[in-house]
Interface confidence: medium
């Protein structure tokens, strides 16, 4: 209530002779600051004097502190909040009640605190969980109701008198609520810790023993077992006997049931501590253990590996991988059940021993087609040699081998023939399923691996085939060697390089692009007349009469080919000029007379010149000279000259006679 002073501090403090006591304390006075403080030991209220009697351990007044007991007792408080005290050292006779007499200006209060000082250091207290099970982590707590700044202590954990290696966590409390020192140890007990003594030892700062507390661990655990086997190495041969004994070395609580397991599976009707196996077979090889249960659970012994030895069983071969591709690597594994494991292997390829191969595995780094076949093996151990099993088949796959393109036709092949080719191969695995041909053409494949070329071209030079399974193998190309008549026959002028003029030396060449066979004959003809049988036709001095349409023929054993007609043109100056007169060379005056300059020229005459009997050129330049009306004076000899790009030519004189008309004669 509001009429009380309010104090907070531990109710009782514990210490021992020679230690110290630290009393954490807070207060709140009813009014104003503290003016007087007296610490009594076992105070008694005197009704007569209305004061407290008792030993004064400490006193302070407004006038200042009064020394008491050479500062053994210290008031560490203040005038309004803190009332903490320290007694150092503390003595056995300090036990009892401490009275804090507090006075303010108007109010007084006596606060009592119990002090329990023992003759010797009192022991700490170990706290354990209600149940401890093996391998489950627990926290062990050691608690001491003591802590003082002036008197350091330590708590150490021991197991069977030996310091425990686990790290403990120590904490202290010096508060108005509690004063203690506590050590906590996290610990995973094993079954072997059952019944062991754990100690918490109180030590001073120098590690000197002060006191301790001990507990005995009760670690609940499954039964711990030992298995014994006769023979001790647990290696026997078929038909031998084996005895196994199970011994319980520890169980908490007591065990209830016993059983035996082989390879993790319980053996029926085996519920005693002894397992007798008579006339063992290889099937009884395995891992044996005994299992004993209690309320915590089942406990298992270590496993005994019983090895029933026997000679290798018939072997099998495992191939990695079949089918194998030529050039790849392959591994064979010989598998044979045996105990002890086989020490030696004999390998067979197609029934024939493979020397130098005595290991469980055979590795072939580069497989070839002839490696194909049946691989078998025989395993051997100290008890004997196994039988050779059926073996495994190695299939070696490879592209078709020795592929050839074969021409089926009789030779030679002629242009236009039907050619049949076949694609042959020596061996293939897997089987050939298709064929390819080069070059590609719109050709017929009447059956697998056969190619028919209808109307074979002159330029079908080589053909190659490929036989294909999973891979294609190409044959070398085969030459068809198609024979054909000469091709692209044409006439070519070799000389002269420019146009041909009359009198030139002229050579014509009969050209062709190809011929098979190469042996050829030539024929030249003009207007159906044979001119020569050489590749060239030569004219030492060409004349206009040689002009015309020429052809050459080239022959081989297959046939003959003609060129297109080639026109030979000879250029020459005007020749064979003559003057023709129309209507005749005798014309009556007054009529019309036409003189024509006729000529033979190549190119044609481009320019004419007319001359009279006096070789006087006339002002006429066309081919025809027209005199109209013709006069008697026109009578005389005329000639003409023709000119072309090659040259000039002149005609002989032609005489025109103009006679008088009857009228003129009549007038005379």
């Amino acid at each position: 209530d509001s009429s009380k002073w309010v104090f907070e501090h531990p109710e009782t403090l514990y210490a021992w002779e020679g230690a110290c006591v630290w009393i954490p304390c807070t207060y709140r006075a009813l009014d104003g600051d503290l003016e007087s403080f007296i610490l009594f030991h076992n105070p008694e209220y005197n009704k007569n004097t209305s004061k407290f009697d008792g030993t004064r351990l400490y006193e302070s007044t407004k006038d200042g502190k009064v020394p008491s007991e050479q500062k053994r007792v210290q008031f560490l408080g203040d005038k309004n909040k803190n009332c903490t005290l320290s007694i150092h050292p503390v003595h056995l006779n300090d036990s009892g009640q401490l009275g804090l007499r507090m006075e303010s200006k108007t109010e007084k209060w006596m606060e009592r605190i119990h002090l329990n000082v023992s003759e010797r250091p009192f022991p700490p207290h170990i706290q354990l969980p209600p149940e401890i099970q093996e391998s489950q982590e627990v926290t062990l707590t050691c608690l001491l109701n003591f802590s003082c700044y002036g008197y350091p202590i330590q708590l150490q954990w021991l197991l069977e008198g030996v310091p425990m290696r686990q790290a403990a966590v120590t904490s202290t409390s010096l508060t108005i609520k509690s004063v203690f020192t506590r050590s906590e140890l996290k610990f995973s007990p094993q079954w072997s810790h059952h019944g062991k003594i754990v100690t918490c030892q109180l030590q001073d700062a120098d590690g000197k023993f002060l006191s301790n507390d001990t507990v005995q661990l009760n670690v609940k655990h499954t039964p711990k077992l030992e298995i014994k086997v006769t023979p001790s190495d647990a290696i026997v041969r078929e038909g031998d006997s084996v005895t196994m004994t199970c011994e319980v070395s520890s169980s908490n609580p007591e065990y209830t049931t016993v059983s035996w397991l082989k390879d993790g599976t319980s053996l029926k009707k085996q519920n005693t501590f002894t397992l007798n196996l008579r006339e063992v077979t290889k099937d009884q090889s395995g891992k044996y253990c005994c299992q004993v249960s209690n309320d915590v659970g089942p406990g298992r012994s270590e496993e005994v590996f019983l090895q029933v030895q026997y000679a290798p069983e018939p072997s099998t071969v495992q191939i990695l991988h079949s089918p194998a591709v030529e050039g790849s690597q392959v591994e064979f594994l010989c598998m044979s059940l045996a105990n002890p494991l086989p020490t030696n292997y004999t390998w067979y390829h197609n029934g024939k021993e493979m020397q130098g191969r005595t290991e469980e595995k055979v590795h072939i780094p580069k497989i070839l087609p002839w490696h194909a076949g049946t691989y078998s093996c025989v395993a051997e151990n100290i008890l004997g040699t196994g039988q050779r099993g059926p073996g495994a088949e190695l299939d070696v796959q490879y592209p078709p081998k020795k592929v050839t393109t074969v021409i089926q036709n009789p030779m030679p092949i002629r242009e236009g023939d039907t050619v049949t080719l076949s694609c042959n191969y020596n061996s293939s695995n897997p089987s050939v399923t298709r064929y390819e041909w080069k070059p590609h053409g719109a050709w017929e494949e009447p059956s697998l691996g056969v190619l028919k070329i209808q109307n074979v071209g002159w330029d079908n030079t080589t053909i190659a085939c490929a036989a294909c399974n999973s891979w294609c193998s190409w044959a070398s190309p085969v030459a068809l060697n198609v024979q054909y008549a000469p091709r692209d026959v044409r006439v070519r002028k070799i000389k002269p390089l420019s146009e041909i003029h009359s009198g030139n030396s002229v050579s014509l060449q009969c050209d062709f692009s190809s011929s098979h066979p190469k042996e050829v004959q030539f024929f030249w003809e003009k207007n159906g007349r044979l001119l020569g049988k050489e590749s060239q036709l030569n004219f030492d001095s060409i004349s206009p009469e040689d002009a015309g349409s020429y052809s050459c023929w080239v022959n081989n054993s297959i046939g003959q080919t003609a060129s297109k007609a080639w026109t030979l043109e000879v250029l020459y100056a005007p020749r064979r000029l003559r003057v023709s007169m129309s209507p005749g060379d005798q014309v009556m005056e007054g009529k019309s007379a036409t003189l024509t300059c006729e000529s033979d020229a190549n190119p044609p005459v481009s320019h004419y010149t007319w001359f009279d009997w006096n070789n006087q050129s006339l002002p006429y330049h066309s081919q025809k000279l027209r005199l109209e009306p013709v006069k008697v004076q026109h009578s005389g000899a005329y000639w003409c000259q023709g000119t072309n790009s090659v040259g000039k030519g002149r005609s002989p004189l032609s005489t025109l006679t103009v006679y008088y008309s009857p009228e003129t004669i009549g007038r005379r």
Epitope: N344, W347, K352, M354, Q355, G356, R357, T358, L368, W370
Partner: antibody, heavy 118, light 107 residues
Framework: QVQLVQSGAEVKKPGASVKVSCKAS????????IHWVRQAPGQGLEWMGW????????NYAQKFQGRVTMTRDTSIGTAYMELSRLRSDDTAIYYC???????????WGQGTLVTVSS | DIQMTQSPSSLSASVGDRVTITCRAS??????LNWYQQKPGKAPKLLIY???SLHSGVPSRFSGSGSGTDFTLTISSLQPEDFATYCC?????????FGQGTKVEIK
């Protein structure tokens, strides 16, 4: 590297015996058969027989049956060929050889010349 | 016993020539045929095994073919170091047997 080193040349009298040794190195001695082949002067190669160094098993050519003995000592990796009742036509170079898994002779000793002469 | 017959017993050739040696077995030996080269005063050396497989380190100008009873050793372009005696051997069965050899001489 694989090596087959043979003992040195021998000169023997007719009726005597000769024992040629062959020291193998560079491979597992017990893993490969040892074959013995001989070559008379100016003649071709003649197969005499084999020994399996692993088991000690042997196989002799009919011609040498009863006269030839092939043995081995695995502790020192050595094969031996002993030919008894020597005749002058036994004069030859004797080769020890190693036969591979696929039955071809891949390594030959340097040869031992045995001369039988009275 | 399986008889091995080689032909020719000798041949003369020039550097660069293509040379072919044949070997015939008296019964089928599948592909269990090996070829060896021997030079005077030296031990034979393996060239070809299993009829057509080139032994490691042997030049590719050497090749083998055949199966059953007829086998061929071919040297595509004869080199100066190839003048020697060549011998075939069957490894199909015991006793192992050799051909009588073919001597390749310089023409």
């Amino acid at each position: 590297q694989v090596q087959l080193v043979q003992s040195g040349a021998e000169v023997k009298k007719p009726g005597a015996s000769v024992k040629v040794s062959c020291k193998a190195s560079g491979y597992t001695f017990t893993g490969y058969y040892i074959h013995w082949v001989r070559q008379a002067p100016g003649q071709g190669l003649e197969w005499m027989g084999w020994i399996n160094p692993n088991s000690g098993g042997t196989n002799y050519a009919q011609k040498f049956q009863g006269r030839v003995t092939m043995t081995r000592d695995t502790s020192i990796g050595t094969a031996y060929m002993e030919l008894s009742r020597l005749r002058s036509d036994d004069t030859a170079i004797y080769y020890c050889t190693r036969e591979d898994t696929w039955n071809y002779i891949d390594y030959w000793g340097q040869g031992t010349l045995v001369t039988v002469s009275s | 016993d399986i008889q091995m017959t080689q032909s020719p017993s000798s041949l003369s050739a020039s550097v660069g020539d293509r040379v072919t040696i044949t070997c015939r077995a008296s019964q089928s030996i599948s592909s269990h045929l090996n070829w060896y080269q021997q030079k005077p005063g030296k031990a034979p050396k393996l060239l070809i095994y299993a009829a057509s497989s080139l032994h490691s380190g042997v030049p590719s100008r050497f090749s083998g073919s055949g199966s059953g009873t007829d086998f061929t050793l071919t040297i595509s372009s004869l080199q100066p170091e190839d003048f020697a005696t060549y011998c075939c051997q069957q490894s199909y069965s015991t006793p192992r047997t050799f051909g009588q050899g073919t001597k390749v001489e310089i023409k």
